[in-house]
Amino acid sequence: SQVSQNCHNGSYEISVLMMGNSAFAEPLKNLEDAVNEGLEIVRGRLQNAGLNVTVNATFMYSDGLIHNSGDCRSSTCEGLDLLRKISNAQRMGCVLIGPSCTYSTFQMYLDTELSYPMISAGSFGLSCDYKETLTRLMSPARKLMYFLVNFWKTNDLPFKTYSWSTSYVYKNGTETEDCFWYLNALEASVSYFSHELGFKVVLRQDKEFQDILMDHNRKSNVIIMCGGPEFLYKLKGDRAVAEDIVIILVDLFNDQYFEDNVTAPDYMKNVLVLTLSPGNSLLNSSFSRNLSPTKRDFALAYLNGILLFGHMLKIFLENGENITTPKFAHAFRNLTFEGYDGPVTLDDWGDVDSTMVLLYTSVDTKKYKVLLTYDTHVNKTYPVDMSPTFTWKNSKLPNDITGRGPQ
């Protein structure tokens, strides 16, 4: 049902859902800090623009009595319960920041008359694609899929002279929320990734993965998995790996690869790591220091959500336009705004664009080095290291099918 919004007469409120079930196990205090930091910046920016208005946030907490798993499995109803709480209290703001779980976002979007924008730090799944009033500030699964297809098809780089059309996907069900939806998208038979590949098999057991590493009858040399290096080591250990195996490790929200003193362990030599460019984010800043790398992006997405709202509010107020309109609700897309670490671009569907980075382990230096970057906004790959010191033969990535190309 329609809920009146606290969003007029120079007073603009942001409703922040503080759900017990979250995409990342982030202390709510960290999210509150991020929101408050964003609010102060928004107030300053509006004041500097000569707009004398009040901007506040209302934190809506789940009681946690029923939905207490702490992860996204029981988030579907929690989101709706929180919306009901907002409705009963007549406390809806101009914008809803929250839910991060794909299940809850999908259900809330489905079950409400959304005449207000929803900003999410998460909601990675394909089911949250193309939602008219939803903005996602962490890379959704669709962006990952487009990179993978682009990279698979690439065959004109000095280090990749073969198009690939096959892959194994390792997915054992213990993944973090982001990984769960990334792999779910790759697994889905109707997805772009599946459509573009000739062969794709999902490995669900540790033993299946381990057997493939040396199986002469394997159907693909490429294995996609999601998680950090430790996750890979737990699975692979020091087992021998056929020399034409390529493991693609998706670890988007982890900055550790860019730290000065990091040395790649030996088990990473057959691995290409896909992560996000750290951009201007500074690893020794106190904003990051007391948060683990993944969580840093989560809190940052909340903060950028506040800055995005401030950006849109400023534009509408300067143009003398009403905030409680469908036009405002649909405006949080196809734009670039000043985020905490610099410009943040949203695509036509309100999803954040970013620069993905593919790293390899240099056999010379045992350091992670950038092989190529990929701009999700233009779906284009840019090679960085034209003569990488790979573990693979002739410093080229092998063919994806055993028996062809460098072995």
Epitope: D33, E40, I41, R45, N284
Partner: nanobody, 124 residues
Framework: QVQLVESGGGLVQAGGSLRLSCTAS????????MGWFRQAPGKEREFVAA????????DFADSVKGRFTISRDNAKNTVYLQMNSLKPEDTALYYC?????????????????WGQGTQVTVSS
């Protein structure tokens, strides 16, 4: 044209307190983290304290933790360094600096604008 002007320095006895101020002009103040550095004669310029654009995040050098606090008033475009329990080794020229982003940062190269400095002398 960005300008940073420090004030509040002076001569104080060990154990005493001082409050330094730094007023900025040019640019949207809230968009930038602010920091204090200091340089004693014959020594490198060192990080003292920093505060984020919104004032929520702060960082301090180990040598001043528990004694110094940093704050900012975005309406007045001013950042403050409250220095308590001062020691002779705190004697230095104190510089205010503006970071490139709203983040808290503690490395010199992450700051692009600097004030002229204000002298703090702590006598024993």
């Amino acid at each position: 044209q960005v300008q940073l002007v420090e004030s509040g320095g002076g001569l104080v006895q060990a154990g005493g307190s001082l409050r330094l101020s730094c007023t900025a002009s040019g640019g949207t103040f809230v968009n930038y983290g602010m920091g204090w550095f200091r340089q004693a004669p014959g020594k490198e310029r060192e990080f003292v304290a920093a505060i984020s654009g919104g004032g929520v995040y702060r960082d301090f050098a180990d040598s001043v933790k528990g004694r110094f606090t940093i704050s900012r008033d975005n309406a007045k475009n001013t950042v403050y360094l409250q220095m308590n329990s001062l020691k002779p080794e705190d004697t230095a020229l104190y510089y205010c600096a503006r970071a490139r982003t709203p983040r808290v940062v503690n490395r010199r190269h992450e700051y692009d604008y600097w004030g002229q400095g204000t002298q703090v002398t702590v006598s024993s």
